[in-house]
Amino acid sequence: YGSGSKLKVPELSLKGTQHVMQAGQTLFLKCRGEAAHSWSLPTTVSQEDKRLSITPPSACGRDNRQFCSTLTLDTAQANHTGLYTCRYLPTSTSKKKKAESSIYIFVSDAGSPFIEMHTDIPKLVHMTEGRQLIIPCRVTSPNVTVTLKKFPFDTLTPDGQRITWDSRRGFIIANATYKEIGLLNCEATVNGHLYQTNYLTHRQTNTILDVQIRPPSPVRLLHGQTLVLNCTATTELNTRVQMSWNYPGKATKRASIRQRIDRSHSHNNVFHSVLKINNVESRDKGLYTCRVKSGSSFQSFNTSVHVYEKGFISVKHRKQPVQETTAGRRSYRLSMKVKAFPSPEIVWLKDGSPATLKSARYLVHGYSLIIKDVTTEDAGDYTILLGIKQSRLFKNLTATLIVNVKPQIYEKSVSSLPSPPLYPLGSRQVLTCTVYGIPRPTITWLWHPCHHNHSKERYDFCTENEESFILDPSSNLGNRIESISQRMTVIEGTNKTVSTLVVADSQTPGIYSCRAFNKIGTVERNIKFYVTDVPNGFHVSLEKMPAEGEDLKLSCVVNKFLYRDITWILLRTVNNRTMHHSISKQKMATTQDYSITLNLVIKNVSLEDSGTYACRARNIYTGEDILRKTEVLVRDSEAPHLLQNLSDYEVSISGSTTLDCQARGVPAPQITWFKNNHKIQQEPGIILGPGNSTLFIERVTEEDEGVYRCRATNQKGAVESAAYLTVQGTSDKSNLE
């Protein structure tokens, strides 16, 4: 056995992968390598066996640079059959390589063809359907012919694929099925003698569904109390388990352990293992592990056990001693950091009274008080009382809760009008915002100007996203401000701030905003400030009731900030249905600073033009059509008649006189005055009164004497009356004439 080149793996004196020797012979194996090495033997060969001798690796080979070791096994037996391996020690440089050499030694014994014999009691072999199954009937000689049989009459023949034979391992079944469940045996006939070794395959369900320990971790006990831990393992129907415990006192068997099976579930097994220690001591504290094994399946569950000499309470604030929350929150948890054992009794006080009696919204959860649907009433001092009566231990701790409220503007919550109010032009107006919040909000007033064009209608003239300006009493933005003031008032039991803005002279339309803010949030109320020069923002007027042949003149004036689509319509009733006939549209309207005017003129009316005339306009905010109606009754025409004829009349010179010609007719008659058949025009000293119905002559002279005639005329005809006016005190010349 020469010393050639460097040995990457150790070299054995017996070449090849296997070697057959007879029982009773001596096995001699030498191992040579570049480094120190060790031997690995079959499990059936005990290192303590007197027949076994292994020399430690010593220098050998050329220049003594190699290591040699020998293994000697005197009087080898059949059960010494197995794999013998020489491997470099892991500390050497070759540890990364496969630094070992092995040889399988068959110790042939005609009387023991099988290494292990199971005759009376079959060896239990766990199997899982669909997985590899090995029936481990290893033999002492590779030449032994072995047959695999299944009770009672079946023979499982190796086919080189699903079932194969390996003299070192036994029968290998690639994927086991239910057919391999049951009693199997390996048979070998040597020198006419039949040898049988039996195996019972147990189908492993191996399905551990769940492992739990009750009570849950951590388990806390006082010195002298009893520890009871219940470990439950839930498995599939036909699954067996082995349950064991690891715990601090296991070495001294501190615990008693009982096991039982709960069969109340139709498709599961529930295995219980109950660990019990009476009179626990400090030494029992630590980790308790329940280990559950089923074939190749394994699960474990831990729980930690704490043992205290005596009870204790320690309580601290989890947050600050003064805590803040916000009204309207779904819940708020007031929590204390408590360490105590055993579990103390807990009472929460609010302002000195038991909290849970004060309101059903207070729930105790562990060392926390949960306040549901937080309101301002929940502000106050909260005290946790902790007590362990048996240990005569009591502790308390107080936390203050402040309930903040986002600002609220009372006027916003009151149902607002569907369309904004109108403020009469030039009027003094008082605008109010009533505000509540915790902390007390700061209130500012703002002005959003309306950039509107007087000459054309604009319905979107005033948008809230336009630039806004903060106001103070001296502001000259928008309308003149008389004052901005604030006062505190109690409304419905709470302190509210009333902020008032007084507008001295309503001239400019826009939006006033009151803004209230605190650290919780901001709220804003917009007051649309629409100025109107029209009473109630909508007015209809009829110049006069026309007579047949006259002109009908109607006028409709609406506030332009509130209304659009202005139209005159005539309402007619046909078959008990009111029909709307549009007779004048918006395009004929004129737009002023604050209003839109639409005039309706119907020339030369006839009786058929009588009816209900309505001005219709659409409210910009509600979309509702508003109608203002006026009844028009066209009067029937009649010829003029005088209420009283003129009569001759005497007047003193330089005096004054009035001639009265009252006429009626439809349409109203036109009155014309004549003197001596000449039409009288108004001139100094001659005054024609209203509708020409009176003629007034001041400082009468002798030239004013004569025949005066009045004529009343309309389309239907004319009527006249005459009288002689005598002027007294005239000159002789006049008398002579």
Partner: antibody, heavy 115, light 112 residues
Amino acid sequence: QVQLKESGPGLVRPSETLSLTCTVSGFSLSDYSLSWVRRPSGKGPEWLGRLWFDGDTTYNSAFKSRLTISRDTSKDQVFLKMNSLQTDDTGTYYCTRDDRDFDYWGQGVMVTVSS
Amino acid sequence: DIVMTQTPVSMSVSLGGQVSISCRSSQSLVNNNGNTYLSWYIQKPSQSPQLLIYKVSNRVSGISDRFSGSGSGTDFTLKINKIEPDDLGVYYCGQNTQYPLTFGSGTKLEIK
């Protein structure tokens, strides 16, 4: 291969006791649970009870007072004893391996309860 | 007890055809570990019952894929495609979720 075979009398007098035997092969009674199921003529099957792999038993509460299931593992046999039989106990009685539900059944034994 | 109701009681079908058998339980068959233990069995003439499907939809090894199970909670269905002469018999559903284990009263399948 897995086999189950029921045996016992075909005729039983009213108020007497029914004794049936189920002999199994191809599996171990130590590994599998086994149930008895009967099918009264013209009706659906009825589960009577289960013998667990470790020898424990669970019975249908409707039959608990008059039913006993036991086994002899060395003989691979399971026994059913039902007393106080009435005519409506007539039907076919099966033993069935109880694993993935009832995966193997015996051929059944027809039992008539009549005087 | 959980009552299992099968419909129809019987049905006649042509070879190559398809059938659906319904099974309804009086309460949910979902077990505390989340499994649903509903099985289907066939009993062919003068034979003992044979397991076809377990846990609602799992076919037993060796059972043709013409058989399929579905459903959840309380409503379950067995479908058989491409009916063959060997498929005739009585089909039963059974529950193994709660004691006592119970079965439906059966659906008899006949070939036209």
